[in-house]
């Protein structure tokens, strides 16, 4: 675990002609804020794809009013760092998107309006624990100067924050098999092993052998969903035994969501579901038009030509929310049965099945051939307590994935010559024979044993068996 930190140094006009107009005016004072989105790897991902490593929003900068006639200077910036915590290993290579947003503070109906001023993106290699890296990016006529670094949260160390350090138990050396933790030479590397069986999804540990549960889960291995129903009866069992949640101050208390947004708690914080026409962390963004690009993840914006008319986002499969901002985690419904692994491809769900099961949801037990387990049009045949594949012509192997030699079985009768063909095989018959497999003798008078030869085929011509 660790934190990616971003320090914005300046945002203003870039060098060269064509300085941009100031984003703020006496009539419309404004202030800036920034959003950073991180994704693992170096892939050229669309700006709309999810920020898999995390995202952060800065505080608002100081209010700025343009001086009439003056060129746009470097604009006043928010204080502090943008911090994106990451729970797992730091990937070493990452893609970033940094957006500069303008918040207009005029007396609009319904509060401040947001618009995107600039978006920069890049792909970088970065080791955790290293020094600040400086960068300059240009977006149109604007220039953004910033620094960034990734640092590990104790007890994690290393370039990926995967090694763990503990204070030494003895002053002189580390325990058997454990090395000193560079650069913290007074600490020792420690393998952090959670309690055996601790749920990888719902549990975590900060000390070896422990299993601490994320909110909403309980039990020694964090495998039991918290039940609130047993808390309702005043004479019911105590919360210590049932794992029921005792109400306390929650992140949704007082509803932090503005403009009629509804609040739901998440393991770490809260999430606002905004009514149409509003978005942002607390539904505070309004006055948005389709020109502002409010639909995320490839959503299609309809209507909303001016700030007074509402827009509608038509979301692509796999996304939902008034701005298509929420990824539908269809795998959380555990659609794959019998231990199958779920894969959400966006446009479809796929289940990877364990041995012995098949079908779109791994619902078929292959012992009884109920599932289609054979590739390339093969069919399943029962026998011996297991299934086998009877393969279509041209294929072989355990699941009909291997191309077979169609001539290997010598299918052409009466000395006919076999030729492999992309669609099957072709038999070139010896004189006196005809048919797909040269199985029919041609009578001396020229009539064949077949009722009639296909038009245009002379006896002895190669016959294709499809």
């Amino acid at each position: 675990a660790g934190v990616f930190e971003l320090q914005i140094h300046s945002f203003g006009p870039g060098p060269g002609p064509g300085a941009p107009r100031s984003p703020c005016s006496a009539r419309l004072p404004c202030r800036l804020f920034f959003r950073v989105c991180l994704k693992p790897g170096l892939s050229e991902e669309a700006a709309e794809s999810p920020c898999a490593l995390g995202a952060a929003l800065s505080a608002r900068g100081p209010v700025y009013t343009e001086q009439p006639g003056a060129p746009a200077p470097d604009l006043p910036l928010p204080d502090g760092l943008l911090q994106v915590p990451f729970r797992d290993a730091w990937p070493g290579t990452f893609s970033f998107i940094i957006e500069t947003w303008r918040e207009e503070l005029g007396d609009q109906i319904g509060g401040p309006a947001w618009s995107l001023l600039a978006r920069v993106a890049g792909r970088r290699r970065l080791a955790a624990g290293g020094p600040w890296a400086r960068d300059i990016q240009r977006a149109g006529a604007w220039e953004l100067r910033f620094s960034y670094r990734a640092r590990c949260e104790p007890p994690a160390v290393g370039t990926a924050c995967t090694r763990l350090c503990r204070p030494r138990s003895a002053p002189s050396r580390c325990g058997p098999g454990l090395r000193p933790c560079a650069p913290l030479e007074d600490e020792c590397e420690a393998p952090l092993v959670c309690r055996a069986g601790c749920s990888p999804e719902h549990g975590f540990c900060e000390q070896p052998g422990e299993c601490r549960c994320l909110e909403g889960w309980t039990g020694p291995l964090c495998t039991v969903p918290v039940s609130t129903s047993s808390c309702l009866s005043p004479r019911g069992p105590s919360s210590a035994t049932t794992g029921c949640l005792v109400p306390g101050p929650g992140p949704c208390d007082g509803n932090p969501c503005a403009n009629g947004g509804s609040c739901s708690e998440t393991p770490r914080s809260f999430e606002c579901t905004c009514p149409r026409g509003f978005y942002g962390l607390r539904c505070e963004v309004s006055g948005v038009t389709c020109a502002d690009g409010p639909c995320f993840n490839g959503g299609l914006c309809v209507g909303g030509a001016d700030p007074d008319s509402a827009y509608i986002c038509h979301c692509p499969p796999g996304f939902q929310g008034s701005n298509c901002e929420k990824r539908v985690d269809r795998c959380s419904l555990q659609p794959c049965r019998n231990g199958g692994l779920c894969l959400d491809l966006g446009h479809a769900l796929r289940c990877r099945c364990r041995a012995g099961f098949a079908g779109p949801r791994c619902e078929h037990d292959l012992d009884d051939c109920a599932g289609r387990a054979c590739a390339n049009g093969g069919t399943c045949v029962e026998g011996g307590g297991a299934h086998r594949c009877s393969c279509a012509l041209g294929f072989g192997g355990r699941d009909c994935r291997e191309r077979a030699d169609p001539c290997a079985a010598r299918p052409c009768a009466h000395g006919g010559r076999c030729y492999a063909h992309f669609s099957g095989l072709v038999c070139a018959c010896a004189p006196g024979y005809m048919g797909a497999r040269c199985e029919f003798p041609v009578h001396p008078d020229g009539a064949s044993a077949l009722p009639a030869a296909p038009p245009g085929l002379r006896p002895g011509d190669p016959q294709r068996y499809l």
Epitope: G339, L341, R352, R354, G371, R398, R403
Partner: antibody, heavy 120, light 111 residues
Framework: QVQLVQSGAEVKKPGASVKVSCKAS????????IHWVRQAPGQGLEWMGW????????EYASKFQGRVTITADTSANTAYMELSSLRSEDTAVYYC?????????????WGQGTLVTVSS | DVQMTQSPSSLSASVGDRVTITCKSS???????????LNWLQQKPGQAPKLLLY???KLESGVPSRFSGSGSGTDYTLTISSLQPEDFATYYC????????FGQGTKLEIK
């Protein structure tokens, strides 16, 4: 014909990294998991991890966590295994293997193996 | 992690003999889906391993019927009913119920 062809033998110094490739033919790696298994000289087999090339999901054996990275280039139909911070005990033959068309957890088809020697 | 212990680590036998190799897991290999994910593989010197049996007793395609598997819970057995010259090799059990763990191997040699 389903085939996995691995890159050639490597000699590395302790502390270095090695990246072994595994090129698939006869099937699309997006349809299957690619597993990596190693075998030290005269020793048994050791499972290292797998990748689901469809979405890049990986699972690693706890012993190699943090030191091994399995990746895939679906356009080249090739999987890769990178092992860092090499030590002499990492000298081994490294195999890639793939599951069957219908189940992700059977090691049915194997590469020919790549010998990695770690020596100062 | 699940431990797999094979026995014996080596054994000598003659062509025609009936041979049994056992594999013991540190915890049950019965999956919640009702299947038991225990495989047996064969490896000859200088070659990659080859899958023989899966799901305890199911023969992989092309494997002779003299190979059979049995067992449940934590105890499993590979039996070769009548040894052939090509069967002299090293045999490994592999569990895939809880990730993947190989046994340490049993080397089958000619007596």
């Amino acid at each position: 014909q389903v085939q996995l062809v691995q890159s050639g033998a490597e000699v590395k110094k302790p502390g270095a990294s090695v990246k072994v490739s595994c090129k698939a033919s006869g099937f699309n790696i997006k349809d299957d998991y690619i597993h990596w298994v190693r075998q030290a000289p005269g020793q048994g087999l050791e499972w290292m991890g797998w990748i689901d090339s469809e979405n890049g999901d990986t699972e690693y054996a706890s012993k190699f966590q943090g030191r091994v990275t399995i990746t895939a280039d679906t356009s080249a139909n090739t999987a890769y295994m990178e092992l860092s911070s090499l030590r002499s005990e990492d000298t081994a033959v490294y195999y890639c293997a793939t599951s069957s068309y219908w189940s992700y957890d059977l090691l049915v088809y194997w590469g020919q193996g790549t010998l990695v020697t770690v020596s100062s | 992690d699940v431990q797999m212990t094979q026995s014996p680590s080596s054994l000598s036998a003659s062509v025609g003999d009936r041979v049994t190799i056992t594999c013991k897991s540190s915890q049950s290999l019965l999956h919640s889906n009702g299947k038991t994910y225990l495989n047996w593989l064969q490896q000859k010197p200088g070659q990659a391993p080859k899958l023989l049996l899966y799901l305890v007793s199911k023969l992989e395609s092309g494997v002779p019927s003299r190979f059979s598997g049995s067992g449940s819970g934590t105890d499993y057995t590979l039996t070769i009913s009548s040894l052939q010259p090509e069967d002299f090799a090293t045999y490994y059990c592999l569990q895939t119920t809880h990730l993947y763990t190989f046994g340490q191997g049993t080397k089958l040699e000619i007596k």
